[in-house]
Amino acid sequence: SNNSFTNFKLATELPAWSKLQKIYESQGKTLSVKQEFQKDAKRFEKLNKTFTNYDGSKILFDYSKNLVNDEIIAALIELAKEANVTGLRDAMFKGEHINSTEDRAVYHVALRNRANKPMYVDGVNVAPEVDSVLKHMKEFSEQVRSGEWKGYTGKKITDVVNIGIGGSDLGPVMVTEALKHYAGVLDVHFVSNIDGTHIAETLKVVDPETTLFLIASKTFTTAETITNANTAKNWFLSKTGNDPSHIAKHFAALSTNETEVAKFGIDTKNMFGFESWVGGRYSVWSAIGLSVALYIGYDNFEAFLKGAEAVDNHFTQTPLEDNIPLLGGLLSVWYNNFFGAQTHLVAPFDQYLHRFPAYLQQLSMESNGKSVTRGNVFTDYSTGSILFGEPATNAQHSFFQLVHQGTKLIPSDFILAAQSHNPIENKLHQKMLASNFFAQAEALMVGKDEEQVKAEGATGGLVPHKVFSGNRPTTSILAQKITPATLGALIAYYEHVTFTEGAIWNINSFDQWGVELGKVLAKVIGKELDNSSTISTHDASTNGLINQFKEWM
């Protein structure tokens, strides 16, 4: 394993780690955010950062309700310096092979390089090549959206079905949902699960004459995707007189594997490529985002890329003290490793962002769910938070109870857009939504002590049940509006937060060996399900389950 990017094995070896341990013991664990606000009238001013996007729109990141003070922030920044986060960041942006276990560059940032500055991987300036694919996406999406691209009977395309899984599904699903306001010409559907129900239910609502299938698979060998793709192809052929020449107008591939695409029967002119330096969970910026471009239009897709590019510029050019994603990542490390927090809640106060937590779940947990460092040793500290979330205010009526009064510390990010795309009832809904956004963060911070509970009339044994400890940390993210540029910026923010965490933990955030073992065993078991014999080759539990399944199937 190539570990030329970091010169330490474990984060616990770094002097700033020990320093933070001492600070945590002496002041961190007893720090009261409420008191910090009383002590420092400029706390909000100091601890909120405003990001200005390429189009002039703004996003405010308020870190002031976190369990930090000036000394803690300074020590965290010292940790970032000692871990050489900026060195690893710069190596990533230079196209170096920072994915050491797979010996690959990590270059999703090159996909949103709309300034078209030279960006090199292995001596190749990939900027013109990225631009070439985007030009293809632009031309194709405009042809389909305008009706110039027609199905085999001459009808225009009305529905797009994206067949993919993981990174080839989650990103496009989340983005098309988040930017639904910008759609209108086409309907998009997403099929990911190998469960036949997913493809069957989708095929019920589309017409073969007017449907375009996008087969999204980096390798074009992903079992779930290719099985679903073959089912779609068989369905299409059965409805269209079994004429394979019709496939060209109704199937496109988003892949790196031209040979497999051709074997499947898709014209390679309808293949939209990307490179091995694009990880699945970072691929929505690539040809994998074609469903997004088709749905919201290419110009909006480009604005989405530019929003991310603006965060990339901020991340690479801003001093550490004001570097928004870096601070977000440092706070995560602070809670994870010093407070023992194991989770990270992301609650968007925005129905359009209802899939955002699921998307971030893959981004964060597949990236940082690792226990071996770049130095090839097991960590002696916690990594990878369990990220979860649901849109608020729904979340307030489910798991917020535990966030407010449970036994676990759950650092939380709340996200709100000041301007709604649907300001109905004279903005009544938006004002109610916003009031909850502000109130929840305030409530988690200030809590409610025994005195207040009693003053409100509670007595006896009921009193402790109504007490809120408060001092529960939140980061409030307030955007002006959820536009393509804003969404691009928010995703890139979390990408670089994830990067910062991984750099400090000294883990490779860009491989995913953990997904392999289950896949291998599933292949073995798949063969066993094809015959009627009783299975005894596994442990008693697995054997028992397989045999019961076979009996009931």
Partner: nanobody
Framework: QVQLVESGGGLVQPGGSLRLSCTAS????????MSWYRQAPGKERELVAT????????NYEDSVKGRFTISRDNAKNTVYLQMNSLKPEDTAVYYC????????????WGQGTQVTVSS
């Protein structure tokens, strides 16, 4: 800096063979459809043969079918044109052409190599 460098041209007798090579640098070679074009004196440049990025499909101009074979070695960033049963009318400057995904949005030309078929 993108470069396509052809080699292998020369003088050959009718019925003879030549193997042209074109080595690319500064590109993600396996993503480029590669072609050979030729231009005879006083004539238009014409397409001779094309191969897709992974080599999964090839196409030939009618007059060279069965005589010429295009192939590629992506590990060496090189495309070849094996020319057999050469005829005087094959005399031309042969150019290597790289087209990103074969879509025409990003393409590069080599300098050309002279092939002369004469007795």
């Amino acid at each position: 800096q993108v470069q396509l460098v052809e080699s292998g041209g020369g003088l050959v007798q009718p019925g003879g063979s030549l193997r042209l090579s074109c080595t690319a640098s500064g590109v993600t070679f396996s993503r480029y459809a590669m072609s050979w074009y030729r231009q005879a004196p006083g004539k238009e440049r014409e397409l001779v043969a094309t191969i897709t990025g992974a080599g999964s499909s090839t196409n030939y101009e009618d007059s060279v079918k069965g005589r010429f074979t295009i192939s590629r070695d992506n590990a060496k960033n090189t495309v070849y044109l094996q020319m057999n049963s050469l005829k005087p009318e094959d005399t031309a400057v042969y150019y290597c052409y790289a087209d990103h995904y074969g879509l025409g949005y990003l393409d590069y030309w080599g300098q050309g190599t002279q092939v002369t078929v004469s007795s």
